[in-house]
C-alpha cells in the first residue's frame, strides 16, 4: 500500500493576510485566522512529517480584497509560488480581469501547473494561451506518479469575463477522455481538481471512470467528521464518499473558503491504484498556528502599496452621494442607485443574441449603505471613501429566484417601515410602488422588472412563476436583515466580486458620475 497526503485550499479569494473568524478584516490579531503566512507554517510542518504530500488549490484565488484590486493576480502567483503549490485548477474568478488578466500575472508567472480540461481555446487565443494551462498534469510523488485533471464551472461566461475565444464544455464530457489518456499512460492514481461546486464534484465522482479522488471548490462547502472547530456547519462528513457507477468508493473533499482551513486528506492506494482507505479533516488555521516569519515579512512588504492606493482618486462625483440612513432606509437614495448600477454593469455579459444581458435586476439592503460622499471635496472619490460606504467586506452575488420570492422580499422591505431598519431595499432594473396604508405583507401594489430577453429594455410586470436572475449582496443571499425567503427559496447562488471593487471599478470606468433619484421606488398617494 502507498499513502498520499492531499493538502488543499479553494475559494481563497484574495485573503493573503490573516482575517477575523468570519473572514473579514482582522481586528483582534490573537483571534485571527488563515492567511498565507500561517498556511505555510502548517504546510511545512506536514511536509516535514509525511513522505508523500501534494498541495493543491481548486480555484478562485482571484477577487475578494484590495490585494487583488491593486496587484491584479501578481500576488497570487508570488505567494502560491512561495508556498510551493503543486497544482491549481482554474476557477471562474480567475477570468474577472479578462483572459489577459489571467495570462500575464498568473499563467506566465506560476511555477506550478494550472489546469482545466473543459476549457478549450479557439481563434487567435489558441496559440497565445497554448501550454499556459493544461487539461492534466502527471506529478511525481515519491516513487510514484499521480495524475491531476482539472475542471472549471461551465457557468463561467455568466459569472466572469472569459471573452469569446474560450469555450467552456460540460465537465464530465471533457474529463472522461483526459482520464482515459492518463490510464493509457499507466497513471493509475488520478485526482480530479476543479471548481464547479459540490453537486458537480459528486457527479464527477459518480460518472467519470478512473477518477480516484475529487478535490473541489466554488460552493464554499464545509465538510467535517466529528465536532467542527469553528462556526461553519458541515454539509457532510469529510471526506464525503460517493459510490461511482462502476462501484468504487470515491472520496470528495472541499475546504470551505477564504483560507480559513487547510484541507487534509490521507489516501491509501493499493499497488493497482485503487483507493483502500481515505480519512482526514480540514485543519482550522487559527492563532495557535504561528505565522511564518519570512512569508509574513514578505506580506508586510507587499502591503505598503495597498495603503498608498486607498487614498488615490478613482473618479469624481459632481453630485452629493446620499448614503444617509434618513434616505437609504426610507426611500430611494442616489447612493443606492449608484451601487446597483455598478452591480449590473459588473455583470454585463453578452452571451446570447436573444438577450441584451443575462441579468437586469439588483436589490440592495439600505442598511448595507453606511456613509454619504460629499461632492464638495473637489468631487474626489477614493477607495477609502467607498470603504466607509461599504465597510463590511461583502460580495455582490448572482442568484436565481422565482418572481414569487422577489415579491415576498419586497413585502419584507416595508413590513415594518418607518423605524430606520436596514431591510428597506434599494434597487436597479426594478420599479416598485408601495402603499403603506395597507397591512404588512400586502403593501407592494406594483412591481415591474426590466426585461433581459429583449433588444430594447423595458419594464414589464413581475411574473410570479418566472425565474429571474438578480444581483444582490451575499448578506441578503444568506438571509440577512430577515430576508429568510431568499436564502430558503433561491434556486442558484454564485458568489461574485468584492463589493467595494465593483463600485470602484465602475467609478473608474465612468470617470465622472452623477446618479439621480429617478422614481425607481415610489409610494402611492396617501400613504407617504
Amino acid at each position: 500500500a502507498w499513502e498520499l497526503t492531499i493538502l488543499h485550499t479553494n475559494d481563497v479569494h484574495s485573503r493573503l493576510e490573516q482575517t477575523s473568524e468570519d473572514s473579514s478584516k482582522c481586528v483582534n490579531a490573537s483571534r485571527c485566522m488563515g492567511g498565507v503566512a500561517r498556511l505555510f507554517t502548517k504546510v511545512q510542518q506536514i511536509r516535514r512529517a509525511e513522505p508523500n504530500v501534494l498541495l493543491l488549490d481548486a480555484g478562485d484565488q482571484y477577487q475578494g480584497t484590495i490585494w487583488f484590486t491593486v496587484y491584479k493576480g501578481a500576488e497570487v502567483a508570488h505567494f502560491m509560488n512561495a508556498l510551493r503549490y503543486d497544482a491549481m485548477a482554474l476557477g471562474n474568478h480567475e477570468f474577472d480581469n479578462g483572459v489577459e488578466g489571467l495570462i500575464e500575472p498568473l499563467l506566465k508567472e506560476a511555477k506550478f501547473p494550472i489546469l482545466s480540461a473543459n476549457i478549450k481555446a479557439k481563434g487567435p487565443l489558441a496559440s497565445q494561451i497554448s501550454g499556459l494551462y493544461l487539461p492534466y498534469k502527471v506529478l511525481p510523488v515519491g516513487d510514484e506518479v499521480v495524475g491531476i485533471v482539472g475542471y472549471t464551472s461551465k457557468e463561467t461566461p455568466f459569472l466572469s469575463n472569459p471573452g469569446t475565444n474560450l469555450v467552456f464544455e460540460d465537465e464530465i464530457t471533457a474529463l472522461q477522455p483526459e482520464v482515459d489518456k492518463l490510464k493509457t499512460l499507466n497513471v493509475n492514481k488520478i485526482i480530479a481538481l476543479g471548481h464547479s461546486g459540490f453537486e458537480m464534484d459528486k457527479l464527477i465522482a459518480q460518472k467519470v471512470r478512473g477518477v480516484d479522488v475529487v478535490v473541489g471548490g466554488h460552493s464554499n462547502t464545509f465538510l467535517y467528521t466529528g465536532n467542527p472547530p469553528s462556526k461553519e456547519v458541515p454539509a457532510g462528513k469529510y471526506p464525503f464518499i460517493v459510490t461511482s457507477d462502476d462501484g468504487r468508493k470515491v472520496p470528495v473533499v472541499q475546504a470551505y473558503a477564504f483560507g480559513k482551513y487547510l484541507g487534509y486528506l490521507k489516501i491509501e492506494f493499493d499497488e493497482r491504484g485503487n483507493v483502500i482507505s481515505s480519512h482526514g479533516n480540514p485543519i482550522l488555521l487559527n492563532s495557535s498556528i504561528p505565522e511564518d516569519p519570512s512569508i509574513k515579512a514578505d506580506i508586510n512588504k507587499w502591503r505598503i502599496k495597498l495603503d498608498n492606493y486607498s487614498t488615490q482618486e478613482l473618479g469624481k462625483t459632481i453630485v452629493y452621494l446620499d448614503g444617509s440612513s434618513q434616505s437609504c432606509r426610507f426611500r430611494e437614495c442616489n447612493m443606492g442607485n449608484l451601487i446597483c448600477d455598478a452591480m449590473i454593469n459588473n455583470n454585463l455579459r453578452h452571451t446570447d443574441e436573444m438577450f441584451w444581458n443575462h441579468v437586469s435586476m439588483c436589490i440592495l439592503n439600505g442598511g448595507g449603505i453606511r456613509s454619504p460622499i460629499d461632492e464638495r471635496n473637489n468631487g474626489t472619490i477614493t477607495w477609502e471613501n467607498l470603504a466607509a460606504v461599504l465597510p463590511f467586506g461583502g460580495t455582490f452575488d448572482l442568484v436565481q429566484l422565482k418572481g414569487s420570492t422577489l415579491k415576498k422580499a419586497f413585502e419584507h422591505s416595508v413590513h415594518r417601515y418607518g423605524q430606520s431598519t436596514g431591510e428597506f431595499l434599494q434597487v436597479g432594473g426594478i420599479h416598485v410602488v408601495y402603499d403603506l396604508s395597507r397591512k404588512p405583507g400586502d403593501r407592494v401594489v406594483k412591481l415591474d422588472v426590466l426585461c433581459t430577453k429583449c433588444r430594447v429594455p423595458s419594464y414589464d410586470p413581475l411574473k410570479m412563476d418566472e425565474v429571474y436572475k438578480v444581483i444582490l449582496p451575499n448578506f441578503l443571499a444568506n438571509g440577512g436583515d430577515g430576508f429568510q425567503m431568499i436564502k430558503d427559496e433561491l434556486l442558484r447562488h454564485d458568489s461574485g466580486d468584492q463589493d467595494i471593487n465593483v463600485v470602484s471599478t465602475y467609478i473608474s470606468k465612468m470617470k465622472v458620475i452623477y446618479p439621480a433619484v429617478e422614481g425607481r421606488i415610489k409610494f402611492s398617494t396617501g400613504s407617504h
Partner: antibody, heavy 116, light 105 residues
Framework: VQLVESGGGLVQPGGSLRLSCAAS????????MHWVRQAPGKGLEWVAV????????YYADSVKGRFTISRDNSKNTLYLQMNSLRAEDTAVYYC??????????WGQGTLVTVSS | IQMTQSPSSLSASVGDRVTITCRAS??????LAWYQQKPGKAPKLLIY???TLQSGVPSRFSGSGSGTDFTLTISSLQPEDFATYYC????????FGQGTRLEIK
C-alpha cells in the same frame, strides 16, 4: 475594538449628566450606536440609538424628552445627555454598536447614581 | 413588544443539556438575539437572527424559533456557562427579556 464609557457619577434628582463613549479599533462612522442601561441587581434596558451619520434617533419611552443621544464622528465619540434625572435612572450605562447583529460590541459601562 | 423569559432561574450541573425559552407579545419574525452576562461584566452576544451563532461562540450554544416562541439551548453545560441569559427583540425598538439566572446545582 474598544468602547470606553466615561462621565458617570453621583448626581442629585433633577440634575444633569453627560456620558461619553470613546470608540477605537473600528470605523465608528459606519455603525449605528446604542446606549443600554442596567439598574443594580436588575435586567438590561435599552435606552437609545443613533444611526451612523446621526440623522435618526430613537428613545425608550422611559427617557423620552429627558435624554438626548448625539455623536461626533470626527472624534469617534458617542454621547448621552441626561437631564431631569430621577432615582430610577440609577444604573450602569453601556454603549454598544449594532446590538443583536454580527458587529455587536459593548463597553465596560459607567455607573450613574441619582440620589439626594 | 414585551419579551417574557422562562424560567427566571434554573439550577443545572456540568454536562447537562439546558433550554431557556423566550416569548414575544407579538410576532417578531427572527429578530431575536440571546446574550450571556456574568457579574460585573458587559453582556456578550451569543446568537443573533434567532439561530445564527456569533463569531467565537462555542457550538454547544444554539438558538431556534420564529414568530413568537424562541429557544436557547446549551447542549452540554461547561463551568464557564453559569451566568445570566437575556433574550432581546430588535423587530421594533429593542426590548430585553427579564433574564434567566443559570446556577450550579
Amino acid at each position: 475594538v474598544q468602547l470606553v464609557e466615561s462621565g458617570g457619577g453621583l448626581v442629585q434628582p433633577g440634575g444633569s449628566l453627560r456620558l461619553s463613549c470613546a470608540a477605537s479599533g473600528f470605523t465608528f462612522s459606519s455603525y449605528d450606536m446604542h446606549w443600554v442601561r442596567q439598574a443594580p441587581g436588575k435586567g438590561l434596558e435599552w435606552v437609545a440609538v443613533m444611526s451612523y451619520e446621526g440623522s435618526n434617533k430613537y428613545y425608550a419611552d422611559s427617557v423620552k424628552g429627558r435624554f438626548t443621544i448625539s455623536r461626533d464622528n470626527s472624534k469617534n465619540t458617542l454621547y448621552l445627555q441626561m437631564n431631569s434625572l430621577r432615582a430610577e435612572d440609577t444604573a450602569v450605562y453601556y454603549c454598544a454598536t449594532e446590538i443583536a447583529a454580527k458587529g455587536d460590541y459593548w463597553g465596560q459601562g459607567t455607573l450613574v447614581t441619582v440620589s439626594s | 413588544i414585551q419579551m417574557t423569559q422562562s424560567p427566571s432561574s434554573l439550577s443545572a450541573s456540568v454536562g447537562d443539556r439546558v433550554t431557556i425559552t423566550c416569548r414575544a407579545s407579538q410576532g417578531i419574525s427572527n429578530y431575536l438575539a440571546w446574550y450571556q452576562q456574568k457579574p460585573g461584566k458587559a453582556p456578550k452576544l451569543l446568537i443573533y437572527a434567532a439561530s445564527t451563532l456569533q463569531s467565537g461562540v462555542p457550538s454547544r450554544f444554539s438558538g431556534s424559533g420564529s414568530g413568537t416562541d424562541f429557544t436557547l439551548t446549551i447542549s452540554s453545560l461547561q463551568p464557564e456557562d453559569f451566568a445570566t441569559y437575556y433574550c432581546q427583540q430588535s423587530y421594533s425598538t429593542p426590548h430585553f427579556g427579564q433574564g434567566t439566572r443559570l446556577e450550579i446545582k
